[in-house]
Interface confidence: low
């Protein structure tokens, strides 16, 4: 017999099965071109001189044999003596050590046995009613397959499933989604109502995150606020990585779970864009406004739970770096002035009613004054900062206000509203006997004490009402209470105080008279 | 809300055919494969085919072989098993079933009783 | 062809919990449907898959599987679910659909 030739004699061996668990096995065989075939098997066991028979029994009942020696692939033409237009019967008998071992018999018309590719390219991935829908384009002249899918998790192996029969120029298939775990999926094809046909190879891996994206546990710190009037966040702690099966844990497409981080400036709420979203890699610099924080988990199933944090304002104030002055047309803010063309949020509110909105202005893009300054004017009408209280007002700058993390901190103050002037007198002076000639002077302290860093001073003026002479004493404003002494006894003295801001002095309090009685000796 | 309905009961001669239909409705008839499973009186669950509804391919169990038929109309969303040359053994309960991703019977039709009698 | 082997009868008393099993080489490689059938009715699918219930199933049904077994567990059996139970898988061999014979559980 020709070695090209399917030999039409007895094999030269016994032909009774040894019955072993190991030998030929997964025999394929299909047409590789229009006249040429191929027959592939895998073998179960030692190698070492084994002889592989490729046996084929034709329709007529006639079988024939090809000898591969330790070859498990045989290929052939439509001209070695087997119909390929017909059914037949083949399987494939391994000779070793004086034994012969018998592979699982596959029938088929060879002419219409086609390899069968896996799905190639793109393997659209969706949810579909809580399960996974996997779509993909019918390999070239494949219509009409048998598709199956194997899938696993990280912790468990392969197991097989079905999509079925499918006879379109695309296939899909259903496949279980898992809530919490990745999966990596594999799906072969092989040709439509056809027993003995071969599977195709499996494709490559598809990588399917969970249904739920896993919950972002990261931490953050907040850095001090800079001179730039900025402070950095940062990750403390990094979102946990997703647990992968073994074939997703290269550069998987389809499986990563992106962060983004969400910021929510809650300051200065008259600005353009208050929400801006960016990838968790790039952790902002923030200005020392308030904030919310939210990490959003997502993957290709869209978003998933999210994580928020409230970053407080930072409360850090500029000792008066801003200036008021009151005129009769309105009142003027002056503070040192950042970059030309920069856009500047003046927020203000009440003390005490921080859960309350602020109130804020932005002003037009401005370059500094001669001064080095920057400015914001407001008329008596408007109402602004007229209640005679104390305010907090924080200024943000930016040359970019709709680039939310282009915002700084200019400063933050207070500053006391309306007539302060009159507002801050204090009230209640009162004037006791201290010594034979000193007294003491007390008052209530200011409404301007209540707005840090306002009242620069108190000042004590003692008239003589004999000689209209007057001194005056500066008293810190955390003081209420003075010390007049060199008086003379019998001399009528008038006193009064006033409260002084640093850019504002304040009214004098109603004279308060007052004399120290002679002392007549016995 | 997602059902099958199936034709009424039958009685045929020994040799002749039955064609049993199923009508499905409350969800996307392409998408979901249709079996066909029938049970013989006091007996168990046997599988006789499956159907694509997408495409109208078929695969049925060796037994039935030559001898049953499975199609389908999209334009009324229904799916026709027949069987031919019956025999007395074919008495049975025909069900129509719509499978999931794992090939289980999520929906079944009420059955269909064949009865085969000379 | 494979066949899938079920016990033709297990019984168990009112509350207890009962284990059905289903043997059959395609399971070392598919999952089981599990189905409930009572007399004159179609069967109802319990459950498929790994483990999962369709809607409306009570969760004392769970399943299971190793190598080439599959099981039902019903944990607290009800008189109600006195009935007959298939199981059924892919046949390894040629991809068709088998059935067990099916087990008839009666609560005592």
């Known amino acids: 017999c020709r070695t090209s030739e399917c030999c039409f004699q007895d094999p030269p061996y016994s032909d009774a099965d040894s019955g072993s668990a190991s030998g030929p096995r997964d025999l394929s065989c299909y047409r590789i071109s229009s006249a040429g075939y191929e027959c592939s098997w895998q073998y179960e066991g030692p190698t070492a001189g084994v002889s592989h028979f490729l046996r084929c029994c034709l329709s007529s009942g006639r079988c024939c044999y090809f000898a591969t020696g330790s070859a498990t692939r045989l290929q052939f033409s439509d001209q070695a003596g087997v119909s390929v237009l017909h059914t037949v019967t083949l399987w494939v008998e391994s000779w070793a050590r004086n034994r012969t071992e018998k592979s699982p018999e596959v029938t088929l018309q060879l002419y219409k046995s086609v390899k069968y590719k896996p799905p190639l390219g793109d393997i659209k991935v969706s949810k579909l009613a809580g399960q996974l829908r996997m779509e993909w384009e019918t390999p070239d002249n494949q219509v009409g397959a048998e598709v199956q899918f194997r899938h696993r998790t990280p912790s468990s192996s392969w197991k097989l499933g079905d999509c079925g029969p499918q006879d379109d120029d695309t296939e899909s298939c259903l496949c279980p989604l898992e809530m919490n775990v990745a999966q990596e999926f594999q799906l072969r094809r092989r040709r439509l109502g056809s027993q003995g046909s071969s599977w195709s190879k499996w494709s490559s891996p598809v990588c399917v995150p969970p249904e739920n994206p896993p919950q972002p546990q990261v931490r953050f710190s907040v850095e001090q606020l800079g001179r730039d009037g900025r402070r950095r966040l940062t990750l403390k702690e990094q979102p946990t990585q997703l647990e992968l099966p073994e074939g997703c844990q290269g550069p998987a497409p389809g499986v990563e779970v992106t962060y983004q981080l969400q910021l929510h400036m809650l300051s200065c709420p008259c600005k353009a864009k208050a929400t801006r979203t960016l990838p968790l890699e790039k952790m902002p610099y923030l200005s020392g406004a308030a904030y919310n924080v939210a990490v959003i988990s997502s993957n290709r199933f869209g978003p998933g739970p999210n994580q928020t944090w409230h970053i407080p304002a930072d409360t850090h104030t500029e000792p008066v770096a801003l200036n008021i002055s009151v005129g009769t047309n309105g009142t003027t803010m002056y503070w040192p002035a950042r970059a030309q063309s920069t856009t500047y949020c003046i927020e203000w509110q009440p003390v005490g009613q921080e859960g309350s909105l602020a109130t804020c202005n932005l002003t037009a893009p401005q370059d500094p004054d001669p001064a080095g300054m920057a400015t914001y004017s407001w008329s008596r009408e408007s109402g602004a900062m007229g209640q005679e209280k104390c305010y907090h007002i924080t200024i943000f700058a930016s040359a970019h206000p709709k680039k939310l993390t282009l915002w700084s901190t200019v400063l933050s103050t207070y500053h006391f509203g309306g007539n302060a002037s009159a507002a801050g007198t204090p009230h209640h002076v009162s004037v006791k006997n201290h010594s034979l000639d000193s007294v003491s002077v007390d008052w209530a302290p200011s409404l301007l004490s209540t707005c840090p860093g306002v009242l620069k001073e108190y000042v004590v003026r003692c008239r003589d009402e004999d000689s209209n002479q007057v001194s005056e004493h500066p008293v810190q404003p955390t003081e209420t209470q003075v010390t007049l002494s060199d008086l003379r006894a019998g001399v009528a003295y008038t006193v009064q105080v006033r409260a002084d801001t640093a850019w504002l002095r304040g009214a004098w309090s109603q004279p308060q008279r007052f004399s120290i009685k002679v002392q007549v000796s016995d | 809300q997602v059902q099958l309905v199936q034709s009424g009961a039958e009685v045929k001669k020994p040799g002749a055919s039955v064609r049993v239909s199923c009508k499905a409705s409350?969800?996307?008839?392409?998408?979901?494969?249709i079996h066909w499973v029938r049970q013989a009186p006091g007996q168990g669950l046997e599988w006789m085919g499956i159907?694509?509804?997408?495409?109208?391919?078929?695969s049925y169990a060796q037994k039935f072989q030559g001898r049953v038929t499975m199609t389908r109309d999209t334009s009324t969303t229904t799916v026709y098993m027949e069987l031919s040359s019956l025999r007395s053994e074919d008495t049975a309960v025909y069900y129509c079933?719509?499978?999931?991703?794992?090939?289980?019977?999520?929906?079944w039709g009420q059955g269909t009783m064949v009865t085969v009698s000379s | 062809s494979s066949e899938l082997t079920q016990d033709p009868a297990v019984s168990v008393a009112l509350g207890q919990t009962v284990r059905i099993t289903c043997q059959g080489d395609?399971?070392?490689?598919?999952?089981a449907g599990w189905y409930q059938q009572k007399p004159g009715q179609a069967p109802v699918l319990v459950i498929y898959?790994?483990?999962n219930r369709p809607s409306g199933i009570p969760d004392r049904f769970s399943g299971s599987s190793s190598e080439d077994t599959a099981s039902l567990t019903i944990t607290g059996a009800q008189a109600e679910d006195e009935a007959d139970y298939y199981c059924?898988?892919?046949?390894?061999?040629?991809?068709?659909?088998?059935f067990g014979g099916g087990t008839k559980l009666t609560v005592l």
């Open positions: 898959g790994k483990n």
């Open positions: 079933a719509k499978s999931n991703w794992a090939y289980a019977f999520d929906i």
């Open positions: 159907i694509n509804p997408s495409g109208g391919s078929t």
């Open positions: 409350g969800y996307t008839f392409t998408s979901y494969y």
């Open positions: 059924n898988s892919r046949d390894s061999s040629d991809n068709h659909l088998v």
């Open positions: 395609s399971l070392s490689s598919y999952y």
